[in-house]
């Protein structure tokens, strides 16, 4: 498995800007993916989101999320996906083994995978932003 280069920790306001952008991009991706009719969300896929044993902004499972988005990129060529991956790269602060995700082989199952992960990713970015803003409020009190 590959390891990512060590990056300097970003100030939390930088992280918040990145997550705000990711939240917006995730909504765009989901909107387009949802236009494919007759595809249902699957219970078989779970996107890791926030780590309960870490404090914001280090609680976002960026390496795992990035791995899932890179898997979607093998199936879908929307440029918004490239942009999401670029932003997720900025949130990876230390060496992390790259998660291997197996791509579904059946076409319909691929569509379900994309829809499910896109939906979970959108919800995850909402949660990440909430955790960052609540963390910032706690820091100021």
């Amino acid at each position: 498995s590959h390891t990512l280069p060590v990056r300097l920790l970003r100030p939390s306001d930088d992280v918040q800007k990145i997550v705000e952008e990711l939240q917006s991009l995730s909504k765009m991706l989901l909107k387009d993916v949802e236009e494919e009719k007759g595809v249902l969300v699957s219970q078989n896929y779970t996107l890791p989101c926030l780590s309960p044993d870490a404090q914001p902004p280090n609680n976002i499972h960026s390496p795992a999320i990035r791995a899932y988005l890179k898997t979607i990129r093998q199936l879908d060529n929307k440029s918004v996906i490239d942009e999401i991956i670029e932003h997720l790269d900025k949130l990876i602060f230390q060496d992390a083994p790259e998660t291997n995700i197996s791509v579904p082989t059946d076409t319909h199952e691929c569509k379900r995978f994309i829809l499910t992960i896109s939906q979970q990713f959108s919800e995850c970015m909402d949660l990440a932003l909430k955790s960052l803003t609540s963390g910032a409020q706690q820091a100021t009190t």
């Epitope: 765009m28 991706l29 909107k31 387009d32 993916v33 236009e35 494919e36 990129r73 093998q74 199936l75 879908d76 060529n77 929307k78 440029s79 918004v80 996906i81 490239d82 076409t107 691929c110 569509k111 994309i114």
Partner: antibody
Framework: QSQLVESGGGLVQPGGSLRLSCAAS?????????ICWVRQAPGKGLEWIVC?????????YYAPWAKGRFTISKDNSKNTVYLQMNSLRAEDTAVYFC???????????????WGQGTLVTVSS | FQLTQSPSSLSASVGDRVTITCQAS??????LAWYQQKPGKPPKLLIY???KLASGVPSRFSGSGSGTDYTLTISSLQPEDFATYYC??????????WGFGTGTKVTVL
């Protein structure tokens, strides 16, 4: 029956401008595909010009040589994509095709759809 | 970004096995299509996603490859297969791009 119909070709003088249209019929613009312009000079190969994404954002990708002189745009209400061509030269003489491509696994080969092409001749 | 197709032309007989290759200057992650074109007509899709046969295309056409190297094979050339063949990458995201191979003209030996 899904179709793409190009129009707007014809004879134009060097330095002139032309706007080509690509009208979709039998389907309406929705997410998960790209519409592109491709050209073919007489007796030559296919040459990609530009693509525009049909979805939440009108992302565009231009061939490096096309940037500046060629501009793609779309009108969702008219189900039409346009190619504005400026400062035309003799070497721009070609049949111009518009084509629809999949943005992935969506509808698979149904997304690969080509028009019949429109001839643009640049000559004085 | 470049797609190099070879050979640029080939002569073959009916019944021959024909192989055309397409090499990308960087990995295109199987975002590759193959077309057949006859004079005065738009290209006709044969293969998409490197190896998937388009609907209505005879099974004598097949595609293979991954990463940077791809192949179109016609297992037994038929009279209607004499035409020009193109490979194309159709990746929308910025890390690959779009483009066509230079073409391979298949003529009667």
């Amino acid at each position: 029956q899904s179709q793409l119909v190009e129009s707007g070709g014809g004879l134009v003088q060097p330095g002139g401008s032309l706007r080509l249209s690509c009208a979709a019929s039998g389907f309406s613009f929705s997410a998960n595909y790209w519409i592109c312009w491709v050209r073919q000079a007489p007796g030559k190969g296919l040459e990609w010009i530009v693509c525009i994404y049909i979805g939440s954002r009108a992302d565009t990708y231009y061939a490096p040589w096309a940037k500046g002189r060629f501009t793609i745009s779309k009108d969702n209400s008219k189900n039409t994509v346009y190619l504005q061509m400026n400062s035309l030269r003799a070497e721009d003489t070609a049949v111009y095709f518009c084509a629809r491509f999949s943005s992935g696994i969506y509808d698979l080969d149904r997304f690969f759809l080509w028009g019949q092409g429109t001839l643009v001749t640049v000559s004085s | 970004f470049q797609l190099t197709q070879s050979p640029s032309s080939l002569s073959a007989s009916v019944g021959d096995r024909v192989t055309i290759t397409c090499q990308a200057s960087q990995s295109i992650e199987s975002w590759l299509a193959w077309y057949q074109q006859k004079p005065g007509k738009p290209p006709k899709l044969l293969i998409y996603q490197a190896s998937k046969l388009a609907s209505g295309v005879p099974s004598r056409f097949s595609g293979s490859g991954s990463g940077t190297d791809y192949t179109l094979t016609i297992s037994s050339l038929q009279p209607e297969d004499f035409a020009t063949y193109y490979c194309q990458t159709y990746y929308g995201g910025g890390h690959i791009g779009w483009g066509f191979g230079t073409g391979t003209k298949v003529t009667v030996l």
